[in-house]
Each structure stands twice: as structure tokens, then as C-alpha cells.
């Protein structure tokens, strides 16, 4: 059978299994006049490997909370049995009703993209919850998913997230929109509004055209025992133990304390919806309890004090101080004053000495005080804060903060290329390609400062010199390297860079990148002399730039040939002369060859070459630049893209050739080589390249 | 405590309309309640008509809803019946009540309306 | 509509004696939302507006003396006046709050005997 070039390209040529799991096919090769000898394509055929998914693809997630994909939501697996860190997810589309996020990275960074199986198994992707202004009982989000790994199918998925009111949530012990209790003055009376207390979730369960003729039933079912309910200023009491929604809305609820004593209060309800005129309705309900605090009115508020941020390394342990946590509170013990945790970072937890290895929600000024609490950091190398509450008990709580920074226990200085310096400017500005932080992360608020300044030039910022700079000023471009002195093509300065109280140094290397032109062409003929001139090597850019007439410095090679300058005649005496510096007048001019020589010690054939040079110039630093080129036997027929002052001498004598030869101190033809028509890519292509010689 | 007092005609023709003002004292009839009419043939039993609520929400009766309307004035704490084309069938004793929670807390006195010619 | 009845449809009790009236309801008025049965007890004395005396099936309303009590569920309760008085003489009636339209029972006249 013979099939050709272009159906293998088309990728019409199909191989089908049958049989063993290894095999093949052997096959000739031709173009019509030539045909290689056989050869065999080894075709090995892999059983397939089915990706499945298994879990009940459905997560319910408390309102404002954050839950992590577990196993029994989300498994893959495959008919291979894959290691779960291969069983790659993409989320196609996003959540719209929260986000997801690697407990591991920035929860305030970029959306997650993707996470692996084993993630999902160590409880690290998270799905948190976003409350949205309005009220709402339940609300359902998707999460578009595709499970990949190769060489399976993949496989698209839906990952459907319900967030409401009616779960059981720890978090979040009320199932009404807002429950937060009232604080009151001892022996006052104090509005209770939405504020404190809001059943308008309940009422979101209703379609909104329907939702006016709603409402919310409160039936009081424990009155407060030291003071007195009123609505529009009607008492409650058990004969009359309800209100409505619409009235707590209205600010008709008051609760009136009695006298006689700070201790708390509260009350206890039922709520439910109730339809048009008072009828049935199905719907949700709740009962919970409404506390009330009653305060001193003589007491003094606590007074936070300024907290500075914890630091300490991943995975380790760091007792909380005053430095974080202290308020200033006249009239209470330390014992008095209480924490409690709103919210919680993901870098960690907070533990109490002697009190289990869990973390803790509430604790004490005492417990600072005395160094029992301690913050315990977890692999996660984030930044966090915990939002905290903060009451004596006998005021309304505080908001407070607690920031917590996670130290990375060694940085490195990532250098990638050494910073170039443009010829003509004599300077550059440094970027993140020269110096950037890594810990486990970037570090993008890196501190830097000079330990070994430079020896030619100075580092600037704001065009003034400068011993320390950051990783922002880096960032911007705003950190410059300017040669003060034009005698060397390259110079150093050593950096200690600080990143979150770790420190490491690196040393960063200045290039000068020559202001040349070189063009090499095709391959160059063994044993011709070519001509060196403004085609091949030019620094006439830099001539301009500099006003000067730029010099060269031969500084290494060519391994087989030789730079030299050819008489202008062929009646000047002497022969070529070997040159090791030469001028851009000098190339301009046509007064230099390269004797291309052949590698010695091995058969004939192409090979490869190289001059490396210095290149000065009037009041700009040297560059070193290179030129590299390739060789070949000479060939007669072949057109070369540079000009031949003289062919190898076996060329010139042989017999019937007579064009081949170029008389020496003349240009030789400047045709440029045709490419070679090469089908590009492909099976074929694969084969030419690696069958023929 | 809240009291309600119907006003209005005790006697009107067959086919005109009967309409009746309750007048709320004692409480804002823009509190949270719900305010009902319900009448009451001599010798028979209750009937229940419609009821408003404060922001003008109504729901009536079906077995006279082409015939019912209910209004109210928050103005004036006060709310009203109308019932067009009525008939001898229409005399009643009519009683506006408070509507709270799930029941009918508070009413009126009630007025009777006889339907003559 | 629910249709309510009511039985007996009088009863004559002697001073101190237990009465017992019947309502029905012709499906049933308990809510699922609240677990509440939407059933209330109305007394009628003669030239006078109906006065609350038991909502949601068993609640006494405030100020009704605790002679008078409710029970049942689903679709049949009954009003039990313990030991009858003279200021008890009066027509009652059950009334549905379930939905709309609310509808009452005919009624139940209470004589002394």
C-alpha cells in the first residue's frame, strides 16, 4: 500500500489496533528517484483509561461560611487507578454566590483555576459563601467543572452548592437573618430593631410579588424576667405573646428593663411565616433565643490598643502577647474582659495551653496576660487575620483585629538573566528577570540593600544614588544601573534582600550588550577567504550615537581560520596580514578577510564556528559581542551570501570548472542561498529529518 | 386597647350599594393587623366578607367578590366596605373586626343593614 | 372552601355540668410551618359581636375565665366548657383561619338545663 506525504499530513492515514499491545509496521520511504532502505514504526497501544466520578456532586454550605469540598462531595477516579494528585479538575465556570479558594494560598488573590484529587481528599479547597445585601433562605450555585487526566477522556462536571438558612450551622447558631441581642442600660428601655433582630430571610422564602402579604409571626414563649416587651407600647405577656416582622421593621418592639441589677435578659421565641390575613402558609421556622445584656450606666468602655501583627514561620507555634491583644478597661479584671473569634484566617488556629490541642473561639484578657494563648500556623505560607469581639461583659462588644503574618523559614533570590546595559545608553533599569523573592511564594514586598556596591557604575533611583531599594521600586522600573566608568563590559553588585524577617544575598551581574550588527548568513565555505565588512559585522549605529569611529578587540577565535587584512591590490605587496584589533572604517572599507579554515582530525563536513569580540567606542562602556557562524565543505554550485576573496585551492584547479573559480580581490556572486523546500511538521517531515543524511 | 365603630345607612335599596365606614380608635390602623368585615343574617350564622391590611393588600370573599370592595384611609384610621347590587339576601348585622395573628381578635358593635325597598 | 360543621346544634347543660360541642373541618387546618392547628372558638351572647375565646385550636385568649378549654387537631376539635354557668348562655362558633376564604360553623346554642 502507498500512501502519501500530504495524506499523512491531512492526517488521513489512520492506525487501528488489533491484537498484541505492541507492534507496528515496517514501511519504505521514497520521493520518486530515491527510496530508503525499511524501516519499522513501533506502535504501542495503551488499554483505556476511563475517568469516573463518583460523590453526590452537591455541597451545602452555611450562609456566610466557608466549607471545604470533601470526598463524599467530589471523587474521581479512574479504571487505571491514578494517583488522586494526577486527577486534575479545571473549574470551567466559576461560582457566582461565593468563591473558591486553596486553603494553602491567598484566599484574597485570583479565583481559583485548578485543583488536583488528592486537594479535594486534604480538605484544601474551599468553597466560601459571600452574603449578599438582601435577605435570602436559600440560594443554590454551580460550579462548572472538567476532570482531566491524560490519557483519558475528560470528563465535564457539575458541582451544585446550596446555601441556606434551614441547615444546622455552628458557625452561625441562628436560622434568622439577624439575632444579636440588645444591650440596654440598667433600669432604660431601647428600641429592638432590625438591626438586632431580622426575620426577613424567613419572609425571602415567598416569591417577591407575593412577599407584601407576608409576614413573620414572633410568638414570645419565655418572657424576660427582668424587664418588659412592649409593641407600639402595648405590653406582651402570655396572653399576648406575638409580634410581626412588619412591626419589629416598624420599630414598634422595645424592651424595658426593670431596675434593680446588671444581670442579663433575654427571651425566647418562636417564628414562623404567616400568609395573607393571617392564613397558613408552609414555610420555614425557627426557634431561638433573644439575649439582652443590661449594662452599668456608670461603666466605661474598654478601649482597644493599637495591636502589632504576629509573625512567626509556617508550621510553628507563637504565643499571643499584649503586643497584639490588650485593651485598656478601668473598672474590670483581665478575667473580665472576653474574646471571642467572628472570623478565622486559614493560616492557622488559636489554642489555649492546657485546653486540648483544638482550636479555640473565646478566651480572655487573662489568658494573654499569662502567655496561655498561642497561635498554631499550618503549612499555609498566607497572611490572615481573625476578626475578634471584644466585651467586658458589661458593655457592647468591640470589633477587633488580630493580623498575622506567616514568616517563610529561608527566601531565595531568583536571578534569571544578568542585567544587559544597552551599549550607546550606558544604563538600565533592573526587573523582576534580575531580582525577585521567592519563598514558598513570590515576595513581592522584598526590601533590598546594597552589600558590595558596584566597581563602574552606580545604582540610581529617582536618578539619585541609592544603597537600598524595594521590590515595588523594582517592579516599576524606577531601579537604574548607570556605568560611571567606560573601561569594562561588565560589573557586579552584591543585594541582601529582606522579605517578611528573612534575609538572603545574591550577587547580580551587569553585561554590556553591544550596539552591533551581525548578520552570518548561510554556511561559509572551508578554506575560502570571505570578506569581513558592514554585511557581516556593524557598529555604524554606534558610530553615529558616539560620534567616533567604534574599535574592535579579536578576543577569541575562530578555532579554525583567521582574521586578516587583505592587500588592496593585487599589485600591493605582501600577503594578508593576521589582525587581532581592527576599526568600523576598517570593515567599510573592505580591507578584512576571514580565512575559514577546515576542523582538522575528522572527516569533511559542516561545522561550527565562532569570533568573539570587544567592541569600543568614544565615552560609552567596551560590550563583548559575538559572532557565530557555520561551515561547510566548499561547493561550487552553491550560491554564498557573502563575498569570497579567494576559494579553496583544490576548487581553483580542477579541471572544467572554470566558473567556480573567483579571482582573488574580487567580490564573489552575492545571491542568497534558496531555502529548500520543506514540508513543514508532520509525520513526514519527521521522517525526512531523521531517515535521510 | 384598640375599639372599632361601624357607621353608615341602615337601610338601603335593592340593587343600589350598601357602604359602611369602620372607624379605629385606641391604635394605628397602620399597625400590623389585618382589618375584616364579616356579617351576620338575623337568626343565622357568620360570614366572613373580606379583609385589608393597612398598605391596601385585600382578599375577599369569592362567593361576593365581583360585589365587594374593601378601602382604607390611614388618614383618617379608618377603613370601609362597599357591596354593590344588593339584595334582600344582603340584610345582615355587618361587624368590622381587627384581624391578629391568625384570628378575630377585637370587633365592632356592628350595624344592621336591612335591604328594602 | 373548607366547609365547618358543627354538633350538636344546641345543647341544654344544668349549672356546674360539663358541655361538650363538635367541630369539623372538611380537610384539614393544620400548618406545616408552624405545627399549629388554624381552628378558633368564638362566644356570641345575644345582641352582642362575637368575642375570641381559643385560637389555634387549644389557646385561651387572654382574660377567658379556664372553664373554657380547646382541644383536637387535624380535622376535628372540640370546645369544652368544664362546669357551665349562667353567663355561658350563647351561641359558639368554630371558624377556620387555614385559607381564604375563612369560613365559620354554623353554630352551637348553649341553654342551661
Known amino acids: 500500500r502507498t500512501r502519501s506525504g500530504s495524506q499523512l499530513d491531512g492526517g488521513l492515514v489512520l492506525f487501528s489496533h488489533r491484537g498484541t499491545l505492541d507492534g507496528g509496521f515496517r514501511f519504505r520511504l521514497s520521493d520518486g528517484e530515491h527510496t530508503s532502505p525499511g524501516h519499522f514504526f513501533r506502535v504501542t497501544a495503551q488499554k483505556q483509561v476511563l475517568l469516573s466520578l463518583k460523590g453526590s456532586q452537591t455541597l451545602t454550605v452555611c450562609p456566610g461560611s466557608v466549607q471545604p469540598l470533601s470526598s463524599q462531595t467530589l471523587r474521581a477516579s479512574s479504571s487505571a487507578g491514578t494517583d488522586p494528585q494526577l486527577l486534575l479538575y479545571r473549574v470551567v465556570r466559576g461560582p457566582q454566590l461565593g468563591r473558591l479558594f486553596h486553603a494553602q494560598q491567598d484566599s484574597t488573590g485570583e479565583a481559583l483555576v485548578n485543583f488536583t484529587q488528592a486537594e479535594v481528599y486534604a480538605g484544601n479547597i474551599l468553597y466560601e459563601h459571600e452574603m449578599p445585601p438582601e435577605p435570602f433562605w436559600e440560594a443554590h450555585d454551580t460550579l462548572e467543572l472538567q476532570l482531566s487526566s491524560p490519557p483519558a477522556r475528560d470528563v465535564a462536571a457539575t458541582l451544585a452548592v446550596a446555601v441556606s438558612f434551614e441547615a444546622a450551622c455552628p458557625q452561625r447558631p441562628s436560622h434568622l437573618w439577624k439575632n444579636k441581642g440588645l444591650w440596654v442600660p440598667e433600669g432604660q428601655r431601647a428600641r429592638i430593631t432590625v438591626a438586632a433582630l431580622d426575620a426577613s430571610n424567613l419572609l425571602a422564602s415567598v416569591p417577591s410579588p407575593q412577599r407584601s402579604e407576608h409576614d413573620v409571626l414572633f410568638q414570645v414563649t419565655q418572657f424576660p424576667s427582668r424587664g418588659q416587651l412592649l409593641v407600639s407600647e402595648e405590653p406582651l405577656h402570655a396572653g399576648q405573646p406575638h409580634f410581626l416582622q412588619s412591626q419589629l421593621a416598624a420599630g414598634q418592639l422595645v424592651y424595658a428593663h426593670g431596675g434593680g441589677g446588671t444581670q442579663q435578659d433575654g427571651f425566647h421565641f418562636r417564628a414562623h411565616l404567616q400568609g395573607p390575613a393571617g392564613a397558613s402558609v408552609a414555610g420555614p421556622q425557627t426557634s431561638e433565643a433573644f439575649a439582652i445584656t443590661v449594662r452599668d450606666v456608670n461603666e466605661r468602655p474598654p478601649q482597644p490598643q493599637a495591636s502589632v501583627p504576629l509573625r512567626l514561620t509556617r508550621g510553628s507555634r507563637a504565643p499571643i502577647s499584649r503586643a497584639q491583644l490588650s485593651v485598656v478597661d478601668p473598672d474590670s479584671a483581665p478575667g473580665e474582659i472576653e474574646y471571642e473569634v467572628q472570623r478565622a484566617p486559614h493560616n492557622g488556629f488559636l489554642s489555649l495551653v492546657g485546653g486540648g490541642l483544638g482550636p479555640v473561639t473565646r478566651f480572655t484578657q487573662a489568658d494573654v496576660d499569662s502567655g496561655r494563648l498561642a497561635f498554631v500556623a499550618n503549612g499555609s505560607s498566607v497572611a490572615g487575620i481573625f476578626q475578634l469581639s471584644m466585651s467586658d461583659g458589661a458593655s457592647p462588644p468591640l470589633p477587633m483585629s488580630l493580623a498575622v503574618d506567616i514568616l517563610p523559614s529561608a527566601i531565595e533570590v531568583q536571578l534569571r538573566a544578568p542585567l544587559e546595559v544597552p551599549q550607546a545608553l550606558g544604563r538600565s533599569s533592573l526587573s523582576q528577570q534580575q531580582l525577585r523573592v521567592v519563598s514558598d511564594r513570590e515576595e513581592p514586598e522584598a526590601a533590598y540593600r546594597l552589600i558590595q556596591g558596584p566597581q563602574y557604575g552606580h545604582l540610581l533611583v529617582g536618578g539619585r544614588p541609592t544603597s537600598a531599594f524595594s521590590q515595588f521600586q523594582i517592579d516599576q522600573g524606577e531601579v537604574v544601573f548607570a556605568f560611571t566608568n567606560s573601561s569594562s563590559s561588565h560589573d557586579h553588585f552584591r543585594v541582601l534582600a529582606l522579605a517578611r524577617g528573612v534575609n538572603a544575598s545574591a550577587v547580580v551581574n551587569v553585561t554590556v550588550r553591544a550596539l552591533l550588527h551581525v548578520w552570518a548568513g548561510g554556511p561559509w565555505p572551508q578554506g575560502a577567504t570571505l570578506r569581513l565588512d558592514p554585511t557581516v559585522l556593524d557598529a555604524g549605529e554606534l558610530a553615529n550615537r558616539t560620534d567616533s569611529v567604534p574599535r574592535f578587540r579579536l578576543l577569541e577565535g575562530p578555532r579554525h581560520g583567521r582574521v586578516v587584512r587583505v592587500p588592496r591590490a593585487r599589485t600591493e605587496p605582501g600577503g594578508s596580514q593576521l589582525v587581532e584589533q581592527f576599526t568600523q572604517q576598517d570593515l567599510e572599507d573592505g580591507r578584512l578577510g576571514l580565512e575559514v579554515g577546515r576542523p582538522e582530525g575528522r572527516a569533511p563536513g559542516p561545522a561550527g564556528d565562532s569570533l568573539t569580540l570587544e567592541l569600543w567606542a568614544q565615552g560609552v562602556p567596551p560590550a563583548v559581542a559575538s559572532l557565530d557562524f557555520a561551515t561547510e565543505p566548499y561547493n561550487a554550485a552553491r550560491p554564498y551570501s557573502v563575498a569570497l576573496l579567494s576559494v579553496p585551492e583544490a576548487a581553483r584547479t580542477e579541471a572544467g570548472k572554470p566558473e567556480s573559480s573567483t579571482p582573488t580581490g574580487e567580490p564573489g556572486p552575492m545571491a542568497s542561498s534558496p531555502e529548500p523546500a520543506v514540508a513543514k511538521g508532520g509525520f513526514l517531515s519527521f521522517l525526512e529529518a531523521n531517515m535521510f543524511s | 386597647q384598640v375599639q372599632l365603630q361601624e357607621s353608615g345607612p341602615g337601610l338601603v335599596k335593592p340593587s343600589e350599594t350598601l357602604s359602611l365606614t369602620c372607624v379605629v380608635s385606641g391604635g394605628s390602623i397602620s399597625s400590623s393587623n389585618w382589618w375584616s368585615w364579616v356579617r351576620q343574617p338575623p337568626g343565622k350564622g357568620l360570614e366572613w366578607l373580606g379583609t385589608?391590611?393597612?398598605?391596601?393588600?385585600?382578599y375577599y370573599n369569592p362567593s361576593l367578590k365581583s360585589r365587594v370592595t374593601i378601602s382604607v384611609d390611614t388618614s383618617k384610621n379608618q377603613f370601609s366596605l362597599r357591596l354593590s347590587s344588593v339584595t334582600a339576601a344582603d340584610t345582615a348585622v355587618y361587624y368590622c373586626?381587627?384581624?391578629?395573628?391568625?384570628?378575630?381578635?377585637?370587633w365592632g358593635q356592628g350595624t344592621l343593614v336591612t335591604v328594602s325597598s | 372552601d373548607i366547609v365547618m360543621t358543627q354538633s350538636p346544634d344546641s345543647l341544654a347543660v344544668s349549672l356546674g355540668e360539663r358541655a361538650t360541642i363538635n367541630c369539623k373541618s372538611s380537610?384539614?387546618?393544620?400548618?406545616?410551618?408552624?405545627?399549629?392547628?388554624?381552628l378558633n372558638w368564638y362566644q356570641q351572647k345575644p345582641g352582642q359581636p362575637p368575642k375570641l375565646l381559643i385560637y389555634w385550636a387549644s389557646t385561651r385568649e387572654s382574660g377567658v375565665p379556664d372553664r373554657f378549654s380547646g382541644s383536637g387537631s387535624g380535622t376535628d376539635f372540640t370546645l369544652t366548657i368544664s362546669s357551665l354557668q349562667a353567663e355561658d348562655v350563647a351561641v359558639y362558633y368554630c371558624?377556620?383561619?387555614?385559607?381564604?376564604?375563612?369560613?365559620f360553623g354554623p353554630g352551637t346554642k348553649v341553654d342551661i338545663k
Open positions: 373586626a381587627k384581624s391578629w395573628v391568625s384570628w378575630f381578635a377585637s
Open positions: 385589608i391590611y393597612y398598605n391596601g393588600n385585600t
Open positions: 380537610q384539614s387546618v393544620l400548618s406545616s410551618s408552624n405545627n399549629k392547628n388554624y
Open positions: 371558624q377556620q383561619h387555614y385559607s381564604v376564604p375563612f369560613t
